[in-house]
Interface confidence: medium
């Protein structure tokens, strides 16, 4: 069937996010992908959105992330903007109002986004074939 526009938007946003490193992409987030054997796809998307929201809520105004130069500042602002867009679109795709995030495992934001991009591309290849 036709791929959801939201899925295309998510991949587009993830591509933009993974192109550039910022001062804070090496910070850690909860790794929801480490043990997602019994998790539905919708739950995974919902939990991914929750993790991203936790990240940008904590680090949007983090002076370490904003940096000392204008370029660092704008890169961080762009990162936050894309994370917010990703959060919203993942919520749209999940269609769930809430979901628990209890994992102890951590990964860097950079690795988290790369893993999410792989999952989304796999989903896209299935729905577009």
């Amino acid at each position: 069937h036709k791929c959801d526009i939201t899925l295309q938007e998510i991949i587009k946003t993830l591509n933009s996010l993974t192109e550039q490193k910022t001062l804070c992409t090496e910070l850690t987030v909860t790794d929801i992908f480490a043990a997602s054997k019994n998790t539905t796809e919708k739950e995974t998307f919902c939990r991914a959105a929750t993790v991203l929201r936790q990240f940008y809520s904590h680090h949007e105004k983090d002076t370490r992330c904003l940096g000392a130069t204008a370029q660092q500042f704008h890169r961080h602002k762009q990162l936050i903007r894309f994370l917010k867009r990703l959060d919203r679109n993942l919520w749209g795709l999940a269609g769930l109002n809430s979901c628990p995030v209890k994992e102890a495992n951590q990964s860097t934001l950079e690795n988290f986004l790369e893993r999410l991009k792989t999952i989304m591309r796999e989903k896209y290849s299935k729905c577009s074939s």
Epitope: T6, N89, W91, G92
Partner: antibody, heavy 123, light 106 residues
Framework: QLQLQESGPGLVKPSETLSLTCTVS??????????WGWIRKPPGKGLEWIGS???????DYNPSLKSRVTISVDTSKNQFSLKLSSVTAADTAVYYC???????????????WGQGTMVTVSS | DIQMTQSPSSLSASVGDRVTITCQAS??????LNWYQEKPGKAPKLLIY???NLETGVPSRFSGSGSGTDFTFTISSLQPEDIATYYC????????FGGGTKVEIK
């Protein structure tokens, strides 16, 4: 079909807080992937986005108004509200509530609007 | 913040004329742009989303194009009921409206 209706005082005194409520009928305010926003139009001027609230509960506000704005949702009443503090005459405007998003995406336009309510700031 | 510059601020045209409004973003916004119509005393109405997609139920004489920083909104054949103010709106980073273009009939 979904309808939005703004309500609240038409006159607010300077330095006070403007409070408006938008009641959603014909659908649930909790529906994903939709989001909810407030937009205003001062007399003789253009449209100005005030802020939005999303299914996750996160909010975005216009940077020029951010320090004065709070948007919240009451799912039990199927309503969302706007509070704008420390108002001045410059906040006199028609205030609209609107629904953003579309069936297959959330990052989208404001497709359904309330009819608007005029709020005058004056002593 | 992203600024949206709309031009002209007002125009007058005859029924049947082709009307073109432009909107320029202060930075690249891809195709994250919508166009709205606002009639006096009425709430704004979405006409075009994602720069070029016609909202359901909107007459085909309305169209939009552009990407990046430069966008165009066109009414191919102006009708009396098209008298309104038209706004562009970006949603690439938060939401910003253009200043509006008031369209009148000669």
């Amino acid at each position: 079909q979904l309808q939005l209706q703004e309500s609240g005082p038409g006159l607010v005194k300077p330095s006070e807080t403007l409070s408006l409520t938008c009641t959603v009928s014909g659908g649930s305010i909790s529906s994903i992937p939709y989001y909810w926003g407030w937009i205003r139009k001062p007399p003789g001027k253009g449209l100005e986005w005030i802020g939005s609230i999303y299914p996750s509960g996160s909010t975005d506000y216009n940077p020029s108004l951010k320090s004065r704005v709070t948007i919240s949702v009451d799912t039990s009443k199927n309503q969302f509200s706007l509070k704008l503090s420390s108002v001045t005459a410059a906040d006199t405007a028609v205030y609209y509530c609107a629904r953003g998003g579309a069936r297959d995406r959330i990052d989208h336009a404001f497709s359904i609007w309330g009819q608007g309510t005029m709020v005058t700031v004056s002593s | 913040d992203i600024q949206m510059t709309q031009s002209p601020s007002s125009l007058s045209a005859s029924v049947g004329d082709r009307v073109t409004i432009t909107c320029q973003a202060s930075q690249d916004i891809s195709n994250y742009l919508n166009w709205y119509q606002e009639k006096p005393g009425k709430a704004p109405k979405l006409l075009i989303y994602d720069a070029s997609n016609l909202e359901t139920g909107v007459p085909s004489r309305f169209s939009g194009s552009g990407s990046g920083t430069d966008f165009t909104f066109t009414i191919s054949s102006l009708q009396p009921e098209d008298i309104a103010t038209y706004y562009c709106q970006q949603y690439y980073d938060l939401y910003t409206f253009g200043g509006g273009t008031k369209v009148e009939i000669k």
